[in-house]
Interface confidence: low
Amino acid sequence: DFGLDCDEHSTESRCCRYPLTVDFEAFGWDWIIAPKRYKANYCSGECEFVFLQKYPHTHLVHQANPRGSAGPCCTPTKMSPINMLYFNGKEQIIYGKIPAMVVDRCGCS
Amino acid sequence: DFGLDCDEHSTESRCCRYPLTVDFEAFGWDWIIAPKRYKANYCSGECEFVFLQKYPHTHLVHQANPRGSAGPCCTPTKMSPINMLYFNGKEQIIYGKIPAMVVDRCGCS
């Protein structure tokens, strides 16, 4: 699998992964004990036909061209979890692995 | 996990899974021996904020609102393989499981 990596200086218009640090304190999410911030990344950019298509299915839908089907969009194709320490609704402290919190790769699907 | 199922008569505007039969013969893909057609399905519809969001990450990016980040889009969140019999580039007959050929669920990511 392959995905583009970009930053704020990139001139790339195609689907790309960009850096993003999520700051829970800045959001006022005080129920999150740790991490206070983490590197989440995000996907942005255009999905020209066939570029970075993760699935053959995407190509097939384009071929079949059903009513209402939009073109593929730039979305996470590989994600990772992070470990978090947080208060649940009952004010208990929970330590757990939260899935799909970090974008590792972006693609068109 | 939860996803909406629709058909061509549905009035649903939100992200939904629609039926789609892919016909390889109609595409002229004569290197595919079997199946000649299969039910692929596809995703279409709007992704209002929070509706059918697969990942907490999607919500966090919306909160952080980085430059160039589009809203979430309606995309497959669960897919299945199908078994296929086909000619490869060397004219050998291959039987194999092809991943991510069927959309089982759609969501916003």
Partner: antibody
Framework: EVQLVESGGGLVQPGGSLRLSCAVS????????KGWVRQAPGKGLEWIGI???????YYASWAKGRFTISRDNSKNTVYLQMNSLRAEDTAVYFC????????????????WGQGTLVTVSS | AVVMTQSPATLSLSPGERVTLSCQAS??????LSWYQQKPGQPPKLLIY???TLASGVPSRFKGSGSGTDFTLTISSLQPEDAATYYC????????????FGQGTKVEIK
């Protein structure tokens, strides 16, 4: 006790090879990223490379081709194979563990070994 | 590749004084910066990660700040045991896999 212990350092002739080992204890090797960092006498820290949780390896541009990182989960050990050694490779070689910082970091090393000295000289 | 530049090279201060160490990146690295402390004959010790988050067990007199290209490590009240060389470190690009260290700042106690 959670620790990393490097071994395998010593004197080697220019052009020679050496394999360093890093034995880990007190935690599961495959759950963390491992890195190698070196420090020439009286100089600063220089990153060599890492092996990630999936077993993929990444190297500093200068290390590619000459240095290889691997691991043996059954022995809870990470290795650094060094080939075509030069005098400028003389350094203390540290093994380090990626930081379990509740975030997602391949590169903050919060647990280090004491280092093993490699001297390249004829 | 990103290049990290630390200043000053050496700093000599008295106990109780406020210490400010600087680290500059050749391009924006967002918050992707760590600080390490290394004493002679010892391995480095992680002090701060993600620019401002204190690592476990690190005294609160250490404080990291900055984002983008300019970062600072502040020791609010220098203690004799803080005599060491301090390194900043970043990740080369967002692919998580390249690491670059600064050349270090040596802090001496007068």
């Amino acid at each position: 006790e959670v620790q990393l212990v490097e071994s395998g350092g010593g004197l080697v002739q220019p052009g020679g090879s050496l394999r360093l080992s890093c034995a880990v204890s007190g935690f599961t090797l495959s759950h963390y990223v491992k890195g190698w960092v070196r420090q020439a006498p009286g100089k600063g820290l220089e990153w060599i490379g890492i092996i990630n949780i999936e077993g993929e390896t990444y190297y500093a541009s200068w290390a590619k081709g000459r240095f290889t990182i691997s691991r043996d989960n059954s022995k809870n050990t990470v290795y650094l194979q060094m080939n075509s050694l030069r005098a400028e490779d003389t350094a203390v070689y540290f093994c380090a563990r990626g930081h379990d910082n509740f975030g997602y970091s391949y590169h903050d090393f919060n647990l280090w070994g004491q280092g093993t000295l490699v001297t390249v000289s004829s | 590749a990103v290049v990290m530049t630390q200043s000053p090279a050496t700093l000599s201060l008295s106990p109780g004084e406020r210490v400010t160490l600087s680290c500059q990146a050749s391009q924006s690295i967002h918050h992707d910066l760590s600080w390490y402390q290394q004493k002679p004959g010892q391995p480095p010790k992680l002090l701060i990660y993600l620019a401002s988050t204190l690592a476990s067990g690190v005294p609160s007199r250490f404080k990291g700040s900055g984002s983008g290209t300019d970062f600072t490590l502040t020791i609010s009240s220098l203690q004799p045991e803080d005599a060491a060389t301090y390194y900043c470190q970043t990740y080369d690009g967002i692919s998580h896999y390249g690491v670059a260290f600064g050349q270090g700042t040596k802090v001496e106690i007068k």
